[in-house]
Interface confidence: low
């Protein structure tokens, strides 16, 4: 665990209960970097600070994690509170593994989203393929789809077959199946981030 | 005061699936989170995982990932937990137990012993 | 994942003296705020209870002669004056990060 996210962590528990519920409320419409999904509201509301630190850093790494925190806070008038966290921040990041630090590629090339530019990995590696299906049902996925998907016999079929019907999708849909990705296989997303 | 009542005793065969039962009383369900452990006969104590009961939102021990699933009936205050695919080594007793805050685990259930046998 | 390790496995503690346990973490498990480790003590056939929460709070109803201190890495539980009814095998707990973690157990018996 790098500094940031006990950076992250020591900010969150020195908030009143009432000015923590005040933060994840802004989380939930806060601006966020393009490529970047936001913590499912239902989740959200009924963290604790060591869960919600816990699920800033899964969702948006440690670096963006931190900055975003910050920036919740500012919003709040906490400018104090949010300058201690990125003073900590910046003071750890040389110890922190340079690919934590990097942006995720799909901010780095907006012309390109995450899931197309992983499309090859996303179909070989992707393992929970049901639960990602259960995410996007109804959003993004007709019944039909969703059928078509869960016939297919494996897991990289069935990728394959999902990835399908992704010529179809705007910009708003490839992110609802980054943030279905994140929440089920962060790892993975992460490892793909930093190649 | 706050109470979470197990269900009994469990004999199942090997293969076979079970669904045990910690009913709660004394709070608001709805705040909390439930969570599981493991503990074999004079051995330690496993987290299995745990759920908040107000959304459904669960996590879980990547050990039990594939072996139990966590539920809730709000309307009953009633936290679930399934384990499948039941062989000797699931043989041991179960405890629910309320999250606090810090993820504590301040108020525990009794136990469900579970024996798998053929 | 965060290993705990517990010492002693047991330990046989004369009435009315100090009973020490410790918990090793393999990694921090503490911010300049709060410790995310528990004590919590278990007899024969029933669950365990909570005795101590982040580190050093004693939870309600249970006796002052329990205490908890440490951050980082290393915690210790004490007893003093320890009673017979504290005979049972004591346990850390983490909830620093998933999957939460309990140490092996201390078994204390009082002589």
């Known amino acids: 665990m790098g500094r940031a996210r006990d950076a992250i962590l020591d900010a969150l528990e020195n908030l009143t209960a009432e000015e923590l519920k005040k933060f994840k409320l802004k989380l939930l419409s806060v601006p966020l970097r393009e490529g970047y999904g936001r913590i499912p509201r239902g989740a959200l509301l009924s963290m604790d600070a060591l869960d919600l630190t816990d699920k800033l850093v899964s969702f948006y790494l440690e670096t963006y994690g931190a900055e975003l925190t910050a920036n919740v806070l500012r919003d709040m008038g906490l400018q104090e509170m949010a300058g201690q966290l990125q003073a900590a921040t910046h003071q750890g990041s040389g110890a922190a593994p340079a690919g934590i630090q990097a942006p995720p590629q799909s901010a780095a090339k907006p012309g390109l989203h995450f899931i197309d530019q992983h499309r090859a990995a996303l179909i070989a590696r992707v393992t929970n393929v049901e639960w990602l299906l259960d995410a996007l049902y109804g959003k993004v996925l007709t019944d039909e789809q969703y059928q078509a998907v869960r016939a297919e016999p494996t897991n990289p079929s069935k990728m394959r077959k999902l990835f399908s019907f992704t010529p179809a999708w705007n910009w708003t849909c490839k992110d609802l199946l980054l943030q279905a990705l994140r929440e089920s296989q962060s790892y993975l997303v992460e490892d793909l981030e930093r190649s | 005061e706050v109470q979470l009542q197990q269900s009994g005793a469990e004999l199942v065969r090997p293969g076979s699936s079970v669904k045990m039962s910690c009913k709660t009383s004394?709070?608001?369900?709805?705040?909390?989170?439930i969570t599981w452990v493991k503990q074999r006969p004079g051995q330690g104590l496993e987290w299995i995982g745990y759920i908040y009961v107000g959304n459904g939102y669960t996590e879980y021990n990547e050990k039990f990932k594939d072996k139990a699933a966590l539920t809730s009936d709000t309307s009953s205050s009633t936290a679930y937990m399934q384990l499948t695919s039941l062989t000797s080594d699931d043989s041991t007793i179960y405890f629910c137990a309320r999250i606090a805050q810090g993820r504590c685990f301040d108020y525990w259930g009794q136990g469900t012993t579970l024996s798998v046998s053929s | 994942d965060i290993v705990l390790t517990q010492s002693p496995a047991s330990s046989a503690v004369s009435l009315g003296q100090r009973a020490t346990i410790s918990c090793r973490a393999s990694?921090?498990?503490?911010?300049?705020?709060?410790?995310?480790m528990h004590w919590y003590q278990q007899k024969p056939g029933q669950p365990p209870k909570l005795l101590i929460k982040?580190?050093?709070t004693l939870e309600s109803g249970v006796p002052a002669r329990f205490s908890g201190s440490g951050s980082g890495t290393d915690f210790t539980l004490n007893i003093h004056p320890v009673e017979e009814e504290d005979t049972a095998t004591y346990y850390c707990q983490h909830s620093w990060e998933l999957p939460y973690m309990f140490g092996g157990g201390t078994k204390l018996e009082i002589k």
């Open positions: 982040y580190a050093s």
């Open positions: 004394g709070y608001t369900f709805t705040n909390y989170g």
């Open positions: 990694q921090s498990v503490s911010t300049s705020s709060y410790s995310y």
